[in-house]
């Protein structure tokens, strides 16, 4: 029997200040660089150690960003994804989407208690 | 895990060429941001040329117009063709890589970098 996989998808608005190396994290995506299959969104894809994203500790690798200072990140081609965030000043304000995978039981597999769905 | 292996250096007259291959292993290339860098005895190492995750090439001016970088992700290799060498560019030269584009500086700055090779040498005598 294999278990169902489902995600559970949260949002959240993250405020960073700027550190001496900057944010401290890369990104992939865009229009010209699809990360994740038909969705041409920007992605976290490192969060580099004792950077500023490090240290507020809520951006996680894998993180969808869907705006940065309230401008949306939707159809944009890589290299002005990039652009943006370093243009985005010392203050810089974040709204992401977290993806957790969330691992159920075998299917027709119910413990005592459990939600019958 | 992610692997980096150098090769292709050697000894090398004033004014020739060689070329450098940088092959990956443990990683989809496609994604990936790849610097060479050089370390001369006695100084630091220097970044020399990288291409990023949508193939944007960069170069340092004292390599300009000699130095060329290009990357074949079918073969998982990034290669840097140096001409017109000058006794100057005798050093390790190294390729580093990093996952997507820092939000922070270009692919130039190896602060950038968690993933080096063991390097091989260039000699221009």
């Known amino acids: 029997m294999n278990g169902r996989v489902d995600y559970l998808v949260t949002e959240e608005e993250i405020n960073l200040t700027r550190g001496p190396s900057g944010l401290g994290f890369n990104i992939v995506g865009g229009t010209d660089q699809q990360y994740v299959s038909n969705d041409s969104g920007i992605y976290v894809s490192r969060i580099k150690e004792n950077g500023a994203a490090a240290l507020d500790g809520r951006l996680q690798e894998g993180d969808k960003i869907l705006s940065v200072n309230g401008q949306d990140l939707k159809n944009l081609l890589h290299q002005d994804a990039v652009d943006l965030f370093r243009n985005a000043g010392y203050a810089v304000s974040l709204r992401v989407q977290h993806r957790l995978q969330v691992q159920n039981g075998p299917i027709g597999h119910r413990g005592e208690g459990d939600p019958s769905g | 895990d992610v692997q980096l292996v150098e090769s292709g250096g050697g000894l090398v007259q004033p004014g020739g060429s060689v070329r450098v291959s940088c092959v990956s292993s443990?990683?989809?290339?496609?994604?990936?941001?790849i610097g060479w860098f050089r370390q001369a005895p006695g100084k630091e190492r220097e970044g020399v040329s990288c291409?990023?995750?949508?193939?944007?090439?960069y170069y340092v001016d004292s390599v300009k117009g000699r130095f060329t970088i290009s990357r074949d992700n079918a073969k998982n290799t990034v290669y840097l063709q140096m001409n017109s060498l000058k006794p100057e560019d005798t050093a390790v030269y190294y390729c580093a890589a990093d996952f997507g584009s820092s939000v922070d500086s270009t692919c130039l700055n190896n602060q950038q970098y968690d993933d080096w090779g063991q390097g091989t040498q260039v000699t221009v005598s």
């Open positions: 291409i990023d995750s949508v193939g944007r090439a």
């Open positions: 443990g990683f989809i290339l496609d994604y990936y941001a």
